[in-house]
């Protein structure tokens, strides 16, 4: 089963695929589809790359915002929609018989939740959860794997501040997480 | 218009080797997987193998693997498919077909070369 | 191995009337399931691609539908010309296979 990332309607996301090059430098062919991966290539592809540069995105809002030149092929799809929710693919076609590296990943888009305006929590997830929220900005250089995530705005109401905070502490403490 | 336009076929004895060509044109061949495909006399069509656009990596069929090779030439829009160690099973009509772009279908089709392999 | 099942064998019908040809998948292959047609002594063309996607050019006659395992090729109302052997081919799993093709034959 897929690895599952959110994201807001309207916000980035960012789903993480990664390789790497043997020796350093030495880039293969990657192609990121709408879709699990097929026996072959990328179903409705998104965007792909040759082995110099990316050479093919089907709309602007598709992005590999990482270290491509070093094997961070994660995907960026900018001002995400409700629509660009589902499957995706990312496959790294390593060369030689039958090599290729196929990673199925799940976006789902939600609606941003009505809250008044409020302090923003800041939390650093270093561990793995099974549901991976995800935004535009991430702030890591090195690879991103499930395991690891990007900075998470939370926003939370006045009025439940204090106890989302306690509880959130709790649940962080329990995950070994930190919070700041 | 796409064109796939097979050749190299004929008559070879069990053992013996065979290369067959694929000329392409109509489209970017150098972005395009091509695949071999055949089909023996009076039956249904068996994958064979496969090669990206770029001819790095390959993909076979287990009933061909250590005993086919497909490569290709983007310079001249050539696809080819080196046969050795062949066995009276390989008798078939052998298409190159060009997939579709997205890796789960094939749109255009060559229209075959025959491959007899008997002593 | 992914087995597609093809039924029926052979169908034996008249010009004009409906054909419902059936693929079934020995486990899920998603969307990713095309069907071909291939007239005696001819290449196959490609008629539904991702299991309900016509091909260019392809009379609107010709309908794909299904998922998972279970396919179907329908032909509204058949044409001379559309007496002949059919495929499915699945790519979703490792390796690629065809059914064993259905007839469609004149009554």
């Known amino acids: 089963s897929e690895v599952e990332y959110i994201a807001e309607v309207g916000q980035n996301a960012y789903l993480p695929c990664s390789y790497t090059p043997a020796p350093p430098g030495n880039l293969v062919p990657v192609c990121w589809g709408k879709g699990a991966c097929p026996v072959f290539d990328c179903s409705n592809v998104v965007l792909r790359t040759d082995n110099r540069d990316v050479n093919d995105r089907t709309s602007g809002r598709y992005w590999l915002k990482g270290d491509f030149h070093k094997g961070d092929v994660s995907l960026t799809i900018e001002n995400v929609t409700l629509a660009d929710s589902g499957v995706y693919c990312c496959r790294i076609q390593i060369p030689g018989i039958m090599n290729d590296e196929k990673h199925n990943v799940k976006l789902v888009v939600i609606k941003p939740a009505k809250v008044t305006p409020a302090p923003t929590l800041q939390r650093d997830l270093t561990s793995a959860f099974p549901r991976m929220l995800t935004t535009g900005e991430h702030g890591p250089a090195e690879t991103q794997t499930p395991g690891s995530l990007p900075d998470v705005n939370l926003t939370v109401s006045n009025f439940f501040c204090e106890l989302q905070i306690f509880t959130l502490t709790n649940e962080l403490r329990d995950s070994g997480a930190t919070i700041r | 218009e796409v064109q796939l336009l097979e050749s190299g076929g004929g008559l070879v004895q069990p053992g013996g080797s065979l290369r067959l060509s694929c000329a392409a044109s109509g489209f970017t061949f150098r972005t395009h997987l091509i695949s071999w495909v055949r089909q023996a006399p009076g039956k249904g069509l068996e994958w064979v193998a496969a090669?990206?656009?770029?001819?790095?990596?390959?993909y076979y069929a287990d009933s061909v693997k250590g005993r086919f090779i497909i490569s290709r030439d983007n310079s001249k829009n050539t696809l080819f498919l080196q046969m050795n160690s062949l066995r009276a099973e390989d008798t078939a009509v052998y298409y190159c077909?060009?997939?579709?772009?997205?890796?789960?279908?094939?749109?255009?089709w060559g229209q075959g070369t025959l491959v007899t392999v008997s002593s | 191995e992914t087995v597609l099942t093809q039924s029926p064998v052979t169908l034996s019908l008249s010009p004009g009337e409906r054909a419902t040809l059936s693929c079934r998948a020995s486990?899920?292959?998603?969307?990713?399931l095309a069907w071909y047609q291939q007239k005696p002594g001819q290449a196959p063309r490609l008629l539904i691609y991702?299991?309900?996607n016509r091909a260019t050019g392809i009379p609107a006659r010709f309908s794909g539908s299904g998922s998972g395992t279970d396919f179907t090729l329908t032909i509204s109302s058949l044409e001379p010309e559309d007496f002949a052997v059919y495929y499915c081919?699945?790519?979703?799993?490792?390796?690629?296979?065809f059914g064993q093709g259905t007839k469609v034959e004149i009554k």
């Open positions: 486990q899920s292959v998603g969307s990713y």
């Open positions: 077909a060009k997939d579709g772009g997205s890796g789960s279908y094939d749109d255009f």
């Open positions: 081919q699945q790519r979703s799993n490792w390796p690629p296979t």
């Open positions: 991702d299991a309900s």
């Open positions: 090669i990206t656009g770029s001819g790095g990596s390959t």
